[in-house]
């Protein structure tokens, strides 16, 4: 049994890091393998992650971590029984994929303005809380070409757009994702999408 593709890990910089790897053949990850991880710190304890299958030869493990900070570094040991298959390390702050924003809501009752709001996925005491920027994707269910991205580079989790910038009388969907420049993160997954019917009063022609 050999590792074909070494584990690569990403952290949500809060409580979970996800590691994925590939074996050289079909593997029952949860019964045959264990991923041991330990913070390089005074008094830290070793933890064991039981991997799940991710395709025939692929495995994925969700590592639970407390109080993730930029100074943290973890040792990783992948075991098959008594055999050490791979040894490595992982610094969560250097491989961050933020959590997806939540509670995306479209407020249509503001005069001819659409107000989109969502929730920051981090608590205020997490460093990323004040460092997320967002991308909002709005698209028409009727017209695949009517697809737009709005970059929200300020901290407030909201976006205002004129309803007239979208077509009236048709349904739209929106979703939002986040990233943080400070840790050069990847983009988060998209939030679940929300749907609304766009209607506004056309101005009278003179």
């Amino acid at each position: 049994m050999k590792v074909l593709q070494e584990p690569t890990c990403v952290s949500d910089y809060m409580s979970i890091s996800t590691c994925e790897w590939k074996m050289n053949g079909p593997t029952n990850c949860s019964t045959e393998l264990r991923l041991l991880y330990q913070l390089v710190f005074l008094l830290s304890e070793a933890h064991t992650c039981i991997p799940e299958n991710n395709g025939g030869a692929g495995c994925v493990c969700h590592l639970l971590m407390d109080d993730v900070v930029s100074a943290d570094n973890y040792t990783l040991d992948l075991w098959a029984g008594q055999q050490l298959l791979w040894k490595g390390s992982f610094k969560p702050s250097e491989h961050v994929k933020p959590r997806a924003p939540g509670n995306l809501t479209v407020h249509t009752n503001v005069s001819d303005t659409l107000l989109l709001t969502w929730s920051n996925p981090y608590p205020p005491d997490n460093y990323l809380y004040n460092h997320l920027t967002y991308a909002v994707n709005i698209w028409s269910e009727n017209d695949p070409a009517d697809f737009r991205i709005y970059n929200v580079t300020y901290l407030e989790p909201s976006l205002r757009i004129a309803a007239s910038t979208l077509k009236s009388g048709i349904s739209y969907r929106a979703r939002v994702r986040a990233w943080a420049q400070c840790y050069n993160t990847t983009w988060s997954e998209w939030s679940p999408s929300t749907k609304w019917h766009n209607s506004y009063r056309e101005p009278f022609e003179q």
């Epitope: 710190f41 005074l42 008094l43 830290s44 304890e45 407390d66 900070v69 100074a71 005491d125």
Partner: antibody, heavy 116, light 111 residues
Framework: QVQLVQSGAEVKKPGASVKVSCKAS????????MHWARQAPGQGLEWMGI????????SYAQKFQGRVTMTRDTSTSTVYMELSSLRSEDTAVYYC?????????WGKGTLVTVSS | QSVLTQPPSVSAAPGQKVTISCSGG????????VSWYQQLPGTAPKLLIY???KRPSGIPDRFSGSKSGTSATLAITGLQTGDEADYYC????????????FGTGTKLTVL
């Protein structure tokens, strides 16, 4: 919000022991290390040791080895610091502080006076 | 005796800028992360800067930290009378046995 509430001031005689408590609230108690530091009157901060509330393991500064004991009670989210064989130089304010590489939150401190 | 050396005192007028240095060595500041703590008179220390240059939420951007080699600096701009306090740097001694270290402390007086 995070709170670290320490026990009240103590006056002890040389040779005696003192046990200071620090009750934590507002966060997951076992997820964060707890440090103890002290500050003698008019002096700077001095690190004493650290406890991992999850398993109860400890590490102490060499200066206090053999005299200090740190424990925790997960049922009450409280950590304790006991210092024995007290001498006058141990007169200080004793602080518990939550954190790992740096100390996010500090208790208000407990003044321990050692005097005959 | 702390191996992190700070000036015993610094002073400046309100509105001015002041810097406080923290000098260490390759086995501590040079190989670890620096934090800064503010201790107002009669109170417990409070985290001001961590990870060399990051501010916890609620700390104004008048406070900034930097690190270069084996020394670190805390800068305070737009000094206010409420900034009058003792300031301590902190880091880790990475040579066994690893342990946290505090600087000698600096008394800031706002004139």
């Amino acid at each position: 919000q995070v709170q670290l509430v320490q026990s009240g001031a103590e006056v002890k005689k040389p040779g005696a022991s003192v046990k200071v408590s620090c009750k934590a609230s507002g966060y997951a108690f076992t997820s964060y290390y707890m440090h103890w530091a002290r500050q003698a009157p008019g002096q700077g901060l001095e690190w004493m040791g650290i406890i991992n509330p999850s398993g109860g393991s400890t590490s102490y500064a060499q200066k206090f080895q053999g005299r200090v004991t740190m424990t925790r009670d997960t049922s009450t989210s409280t950590v304790y610091m006991e210092l024995s064989s007290l001498r006058s130089e141990d007169t200080a304010v004793y602080y518990c502080a939550r954190g790992k590489w740096w100390l996010y939150n500090w208790g208000k401190g407990t003044l321990v006076t050692v005097s005959s | 005796q702390s191996v992190l050396t700070q000036p015993p005192s610094v002073s400046a007028a309100p509105g001015q800028k002041v810097t406080i240095s923290c000098s260490g060595g390759s086995s501590n500041i040079g190989n670890s992360y620096v934090s800064w703590y503010q201790q107002l008179p009669g109170t417990a220390p409070k985290l001001l800067i961590y990870d060399n240059n990051k501010r916890p939420s609620g700390i104004p951007d008048r406070f900034s930290g930097s690190k270069s080699g084996t020394s670190a600096t805390l800068a305070i701009t737009g000094l206010q009378t409420g900034d009058e306090a003792d300031y301590y740097c902190g880091t880790w001694d990475t040579s066994p046995p690893t342990k946290p270290l505090f600087g000698t402390g600096t008394k800031l007086t706002v004139l």
